[in-house]
Interface confidence: low
């Protein structure tokens, strides 16, 4: 029977800069029941606080609700593992909420084949930003990426859409069924998961000729 091994805070993520969650990996348990606590202070403060919510994020997590989240402060946090034989501490982790944002996937993905008489046909893709993100404040710039492929193909074709919420694709294989997905990331954060796939059948008369 031994003191617990050193835990590690391995990930912190925020969906929208208003709340965030951190997760840790326990070290070895030393063969005894082990309790974990996460403590933190915000830069500029000496006051140490304990994690406000160990439940919402699941096992080995700490969730910071709105009233505990400030995007203007760096959080300095550590996890303490304790059993009957002693304690061990994780390394301190510095967290800027601004830089850990991982939004939900974009919503309302719509895909349509457009065949204007006087121009080349194209695939028109449109979507909306995730609901939790408030773009009006100017605190967020969301960037978008689209991927698509014929249903039976192995390789995805990827297009960067910048800040646009619609995109046109010209070169497609007639008669194929395509899967289309979109994802987003804030300027300093992480890519969201891909949105659920939308399927579109490209007509056989979809011509790529001039």
């Amino acid at each position: 029977q031994l003191p617990p091994g050193k835990p590690e805070i391995f990930k912190c993520r925020s969906p929208n800069k208003e709340t965030f969650t951190c997760w840790w990996r326990p070290g070895t348990d030393g063969g005894l029941p082990t309790n974990y606590s996460l403590t933190y202070h915000r830069e500029g403060e000496t006051l140490m606080h304990e994690c406000p919510d160990y439940i919402t994020g699941g096992p080995n997590s700490c969730h910071f609700g709105k009233q505990y989240t400030s995007m203007w402060r760096t959080y300095i946090m550590m996890v303490n593992a304790t059993n009957q034989m002693g304690s061990s501490f994780s390394d301190e982790l510095y967290v800027d909420v601004t830089y850990i944002v991982q939004p939900d996937p974009p919503l309302e993905l719509a895909v349509e084949v457009k065949q204007p008489e006087d121009r080349k046909p194209y695939l028109w893709i449109k979507w909306s930003p995730p609901t939790l993100i408030d773009l009006k404040t100017g605190w967020f710039t969301l960037l978008y990426e689209i991927r698509l492929k014929p249903e039976k193909a192995a390789e995805w074709e990827i297009h960067f859409a910048g800040q646009q919420t619609e995109f046109k694709i010209l070169s497609l294989h007639p008669g194929q069924k395509y899967l289309v997905q979109v994802r987003c990331k804030p300027d300093h954060g992480y890519w969201s998961a891909w949105s659920p796939a939308t399927f579109i059948q490209i007509p056989s008369d979809f011509t790529m000729n001039d």
């Epitope: 830069e43 500029g44 403060e45 000496t46 006051l47 995007m71 203007w72 760096t74 300095i76 510095y94 800027d96 601004t98 830089y99 300027d187 300093h188």
Partner: antibody, heavy 118, light 112 residues
Framework: QVQLVQSGGGLVQPGGSLRLSCAAS????????MHWVRQAPGKGLEWVSD????????NYADSVKGRFTISRDNAKNTLYLQLNSLRAEDTAMYYC???????????WGQGTLVTVSS | DIQLTQSPSSVSVSVGERVTIDCTGS?????????VHWYQQKPGQAPQLKIY???QRPSGVPDRFSGSKSGTDATLTISSLQAEDAAVYYC???????????FGQGTKLEIK
């Protein structure tokens, strides 16, 4: 070792502009908040501005808001302060400083003197 | 007017004596839980950090320098003054309502 080397000060007329630079070395520049602090001749220290690590967030003292702009180039390890619409009361030694956790300003540049006079 | 007020403004002390410098803030800075840092500035030089986070000494700072904080007040103590300690000392803290740093007006420490 940590070094902050400043440049860009000088004599300027009221209403004029200057750009101060602070070249950082000896540490991982993009890991730190950075600050500007000034000191008028014979007076105390006055905080001017700070900027977060990846630079979207900035704070300014009320006395310089709308006239001064802090920025940074993490690729060049350099901090800047653009001074516009300068006034006589902006005459001071300007120091750049590195921030750490709890934003302590633990390393300071040697200072660069800005004199606003006609 | 939000400020950090240092007292005394100047003090003259003999080598080997103990000196304390007080820094009084308000509920938006020191009293809000924000830490206090102390800087020493000698003529013609940039300030140097002597105490950070209320009572922590950076490496290389002699242990005669100590700091404490209670409520809206902070104190710098030099337990046995040396000639090289003659300088101006400043306290500093973050202020929430200004969203910026505040410095005290400085305390000039002279050797008798």
């Amino acid at each position: 070792q940590v070094q902050l080397v400043q440049s860009g000060g000088g004599l300027v007329q009221p209403g004029g502009s200057l750009r101060l630079s602070c070249a950082a070395s000896g540490f991982s520049y993009s890991d730190y908040w950075m600050h500007w602090v000034r000191q008028a001749p014979g007076k105390g220290l006055e905080w001017v501005s700070d900027i977060s690590r990846l630079s979207p967030y900035t704070n300014y003292a009320d006395s310089v808001k709308g006239r001064f702009t802090i920025s940074r180039d993490n690729a060049k390890n350099t901090l800047y302060l653009q001074l516009n619409s300068l006034r006589a009361e902006d005459t001071a030694m300007y120091y750049c400083a590195r921030g750490l956790d709890a934003r302590r300003m633990s390393y300071w540049g040697q200072g660069t003197l800005v004199t606003v006079s006609s | 007017d939000i400020q950090l007020t240092q007292s005394p403004s100047s003090v003259s002390v003999s080598v080997g004596e103990r000196v304390t410098i007080d820094c009084t803030g308000s509920s938006s800075n020191i009293g809000h839980g924000y830490v206090v840092h102390w800087y020493q500035q000698k003529p013609g030089q940039a300030p140097q950090l002597k105490i950070y986070r209320n009572n922590q000494r950076p490496s290389g700072v002699p242990d005669r320098f100590s700091g404490s904080k209670s409520g809206t007040d902070a104190t710098l103590t030099i337990s046995s003054l040396q000639a090289e300690d003659a300088a101006v000392y400043y306290c500093a803290a973050w202020d929430d309502s200004l969203n910026g740093w505040l410095f005290g007006q400085g305390t000039k420490l002279e050797i008798k």
